[in-house]
């Protein structure tokens, strides 16, 4: 019986509200045996693949995508997808990255720790079939 791949989850450390110039790390998680994790922007025209996978637990693998110095252009929704041979998974839910000015006024939101988007029960759009094979475009280990 063909394996049903669970949807990945995505989270951000230290959170989803990041001061301009600070760093953020997106963490993608999936089942064991994942070969490639991909972090996508909303349009899917911009993405980054990594094969620096680690085993987060006996049943879970993860990859980390770090942006060293966040700019306003980094703001927006991100999601994860993974390749577990021979299939691509569905996409995770979106996680919205907010970039705030460092002036730190009274109305500035604090960094939200441990923000994440996990699997949900909504049906798949099957768009994972459109993705390139895992052997393509696996160079950069940082997003920008």
């Amino acid at each position: 019986q063909e394996e049903d791949l669970p949807r990945p989850s995505i989270s951000a450390e230290p959170g989803t509200v990041i001061p301009l110039g600070s760093h953020v790390t997106f963490v993608c998680r999936g089942p064991v045996g994942v070969q490639t994790f991909r972090l996508e922007r909303e349009s899917r025209s911009t993405y980054n693949d990594t094969e620096d996978v680690s085993q987060a637990s006996p049943s879970e693998s993860e990859a980390r995508f770090r942006i060293d110095s966040v700019s306003e252009g980094n703001a927006g929704p991100y999601r994860c997808i993974y390749y577990k041979p021979p299939k691509w998974s569905e996409q995770s839910d979106y996680l919205e990255l907010l970039v705030k000015e460092t002036s730190g006024g009274p109305d500035s939101p604090d960094t939200e720790p441990g923000s994440s988007a996990g699997p949900t029960q909504r049906p798949s759009d099957n768009s994972h079939n459109e993705h390139a094979p895992a052997s393509q475009g696996l160079k950069a280990e940082h997003l920008y």
Epitope: E2, G33, E51, P85, K139
Partner: antibody, heavy 121, light 108 residues
Amino acid sequence: EQSLEESGGDLVKPEGSLTLTCTASGFSFNSNYWICWVRQTPGKGLEWIGCIYSGSSGDTYYASWAKGRFTISKTSSTTVTLQMTSLTAADTATYFCARGADYVYWSYGLWGPGTLVTISS
Amino acid sequence: ELVLTQTPASVSAAVGGTLTIKCQASETIGTNLAWYQQKPGQPPKLLIYLASYLASGVSSRFKGSRSGTEFTLTISDLDCDDAATYYCQSTHFGNGHTFGGGTEVVVK
């Protein structure tokens, strides 16, 4: 206990063909594994030939040098075969089948003992 | 095509000592690398997967590490039973499951 065993090794004349069989015991190829073939020439290193996904998709994946002359097929829930054609003396080797599993990230945690193939006139 | 260059081709070390085997990948394979031990007349035995994770039942004297495209297998507190040939292997589906050339280990 889970195990793999290769069979079909033989003495074959150059330009001949041969089919090797990998048989599983204690588990079935209906689960999500990659069943792979590796060969080792006498006194030399290991050479990867290719793999087949044991799930329903049956995806295959070959070393570039093996494409066209070697074919891996799943023939039943417990057997996978390696068909070899246009054999030459350079194909003389011990042939192993091995199982790649997700929990060891497609490393080969289970191997058969190997079967010897000799190509000679 | 991916090439894995293993060094040294052979090494001799004393019982109780430590030795290091290196495996250099010609392309990026992330953490998708395994190490095996093979003794004469036997199939290979999995030691390390995903570059640094110890396979079930394997002694903690074996340690795998990675720096970019260079991978290292370290065997500490060498035992006579460690005498064998060691191979690295890419487990990357895009680049092929290539093996390194092997390192023969002699324990004195």
